[in-house]
Amino acid sequence: AQEVQQSPHCTTVPVGASVNITCSTSGGLRGIYLRQLGPQPQDIIYYEDGVVPTTDRRFRGRIDFSGSQDNLTITMHRLQLSDTGTYTCQAITEVNVYGSGTLVLVTEEQSQGWHRCSDAPPRASALPAPPTGSALPDPQTASALPDPPAASALP
């Protein structure tokens, strides 16, 4: 069965720093979503080989990609407190497959010791909710990310 390997499980970074999230699959997919989990899951990017990636407005201009959709590294730059949350890779295949998630903890420079990652991977049932709302223009269509096929909620 198709699987999505996602790394790291967790990372703690100061405000303004960058983080890499890698999504690896065995191939045969249409594309990859990176989603920020929470009460209202938020599509951050959609990446498909040969197509201009689509990025949510809040992250526009601060996301880079390397590799291909089968082995994609997503770099999020200039992280802010409200970027704290769990990000999961969603591979678009016959059946949507999800990575285990990456918990990104963004901390103020002076409070580095307060929040630290444990070794355990994040669990979808116990994830910190991202701040309500996302980026700027009110109409959510402004982000223009393609709709994922079928239900977008986690299985």
Epitope: G61, R62, G133
Partner: antibody, heavy 120, light 107 residues
Amino acid sequence: EVQLVESGGGLVKPGGSPRLSCAAYGVTFSNAWMSWVRQAPGKGLEWVGRIKSKTDGGTTDYAAPVKGRFTISRDDSKNTLYLQMNSLKTEDTAVYYCTIEAVAGHFDYWGQGTLVTVSS
Amino acid sequence: DIQMTQSPSTLSASVGDRVTITCRASQSISSWLAWYQQKPGKAPKLLIYKASSLESGVPSRFSGSGSGTEFTLTISSLQPDDFATYYCQQYNNYSPTFGQGTKVEIK
């Protein structure tokens, strides 16, 4: 459609203390980073300062020429940004633009501007 | 502060011309650069961000390139609507600074 509407400009005497306002429409204002950028008559653009969203700490930053004299604040319940200007000098004469600053750092949206003229 | 220097200050061109404006930073700013267009009496309008990313709705005749300290805005075929002043802006740190502007006028 995103719209930013500035008000509060006009003729002010040196040393005066006007307050500019910027009403935002069509945006989730509470999540937006807001900046003021000014432009002296016939001159280029100069960043004045910013206020981050409360979810990003709500902190303010200022350009050196206005630090200690200008204060930026926001009222998320009214979708409004403010610029309190104190101890005005003639060199503060400019069109003041309210902008939405992308977290990346560029300026996504601009208001139409309001002219502040400092003269005795 | 990081200083931004644009050249030329004024550029005379005709409709259909290929136009290039250069912006130099006093220190490396990676790709943290934006370009704006401003017409008299109007607010600036974002054209390009992150050195080469075209803002939504901006015609594809506009393009940006460069990284580090040297950047270029190119208009592949100048249109009547493009006569305006163009500004670059760095945001390598959170103290943004602008170039002094390049006025593109009709030859």
